[in-house]
């Protein structure tokens, strides 16, 4: 038994690291395998992930964290009973993916302009609670070529924008994702999307 | 709320014996390294010792080596100091801090006194 | 002898800023983070920073920590007389598997 993509782990920077790996050939990633991780601190203690399987010969593992600073770093031992296959570190804040923000709300009471409302995915106390900024997808599901992006670089969870600016009469779907620029992070995963139907009224058109 | 209280101090001769105590209450207790730091009358803090949350690591200040020993009963929620052979300057108020990272959560202090 | 130096006093005015630094000594291994602190007058000690620079729930934001190599510092924005206080600055000696503590720093709100 061999690792043939050693594992590579991201971090929500709150409470869970995500460890993937393949191995060589079909694995059964829970009852063959181990993964011991343990924050490089003199009172630490190491802690075991059991794998799932992710595809035949992949694995993750979801590492459980108290919280997380800059300064972290983990070893990782990932063992197949006695033997031990690969031995690395992993620095979570090196490493970040946020969380995916939630509660997506579209307001469209507001007078001709939609209000996008989202929840920021962390706590006040975590420090990318003030720095995430933010990608709003919005998309016709009636026409794949109606598809937008807008950049919300500000750190406020919302979005206005003209009701206007999309066709009326028709349905539209919305999504939100974070990053933090701090930490050089990825993406976070899309939020769940929401739908509304886009009405507005027409003005007058003027001859 | 994390709580932390210590008992067990008193005055004790030259030579003899105390067993520190501390209680545990509002975390899980055997999740958590802790540890032990003494303050003498009028002075600056010492870190005394320290265990793991399993308790199979343990950690002493050179001045209290081979002399005090550390040990945890996680179902009790307590974590224990015993000391011997004391001295006179082992004379403080004695605090039992739970560790995360740093010492995130002291207790008041039980104060020993080393006198004859 | 600490390995950990602390001025032994400082002081200031309401609303002042005032830092008190904390060195290691030239053979202090540069490897844990600095932690910080408060003792009020007659009380056990309070976390007041860790990890370098982080502050625990509850501390006010006037309280920040920096940290360069073997050394690091404690800033104390907008002083009031509630900071009156002892801070000691401590680390983790992985070299020595121990922790230590600087000898502490009596802070006084003047006027």
């Known amino acids: 038994m061999k690792v043939l993509q050693e594992p590579t782990c991201v971090s929500d920077y709150m409470s869970i690291s995500t460890c993937e790996w393949k191995m060589n050939g079909p694995t059964n990633c829970s009852t063959e395998l181990r993964l011991l991780y343990q924050l490089v601190f003199l009172l630490s203690e190491a802690h075991t992930c059991i794998p799932e399987n992710n595809g035949g010969a992949g694995c993750v593992c979801h590492l459980l964290m108290d919280d997380v600073v800059s300064a972290d770093n983990y070893t990782l031992d990932l063992w197949a009973g006695q033997q031990l296959l690969w031995k690395g570190s992993f620095k979570p804040s090196e490493h970040v993916k946020p969380r995916a923000p939630g509660n997506l709300t579209v307001h469209t009471n507001v007078s001709d302009t939609l209000l996008l409302t989202w929840s920021n995915p962390y706590p006040p106390d975590n420090y990318l609670y003030n720095h995430l900024t933010y990608a709003v997808n919005i998309w016709s599901e009636n026409d794949p070529a109606d598809f937008r992006i807008y950049n919300v670089t500000y750190l406020e969870p919302s979005l206005r924008i003209a009701a206007s600016t999309l066709k009326s009469g028709i349905s539209y779907r919305a999504r939100v994702r974070a990053w933090a620029q701090c930490y050089n992070t990825t993406w976070s995963e899309w939020s769940p999307s929401t739908k509304w139907h886009n009405s507005y009224r027409e003005p007058f058109e003027q001859h | 709320e994390v709580q932390l209280l210590e008992s067990g101090g008193g005055l004790v001769q030259p030579g003899g014996s105390l067993r520190l105590s501390c209680a545990a209450s509002?975390?899980?207790?055997?999740?958590?390294?802790m540890a032990w730091v003494r303050q003498a009358p009028g002075k600056g803090l010492e870190w005394v010792s320290a265990?793991?949350?399993?308790?199979?690591?343990?950690y002493y200040a050179d001045s209290v080596k081979g002399r005090f020993t550390i040990s945890r009963d996680n179902s009790k929620n307590t974590l224990y100091l015993q000391m011997n052979s004391l001295r006179a300057e082992d004379t403080a108020v004695y605090y039992c801090?739970?560790?995360?990272?740093?010492?995130?959560?002291w207790g008041q202090g039980t104060l020993v006194t080393v006198s004859s | 002898q600490s390995v950990l130096t602390q001025p032994p006093s400082a002081s200031g005015t309401p609303g002042q800023r005032v830092t008190i630094s904390c060195s290691g000594s030239?053979?202090?291994?540069?490897?844990?983070?600095f932690n910080w602190y408060q003792q009020l007058p007659g009380t056990a000690p309070k976390l007041l920073i860790y990890?370098?620079?982080h502050r625990p729930s509850g501390v006010p934001d006037r309280f920040s920590g920096s940290k360069s190599g073997t050394s690091a510092s404690l800033a104390i924005s907008g002083l009031r007389s509630e900071d009156e206080a002892d801070y000691y600055c401590?680390?983790?000696?992985?070299?020595?598997?121990?922790?230590?503590l600087g000898g502490g720093t009596k802070l006084t709100v003047l006027g």
């Open positions: 801090a739970r560790v995360h990272r740093a010492f995130d959560y």
């Open positions: 401590g680390t983790w000696d992985y070299s020595l598997n121990r922790y230590v």
């Open positions: 990890a370098d620079s």
């Open positions: 509002g975390f899980t207790f055997s999740r958590h390294a």
């Open positions: 030239p053979l202090f291994p540069d490897s844990g983070s």
């Open positions: 265990i793991t949350a399993s308790g199979r690591s343990i």
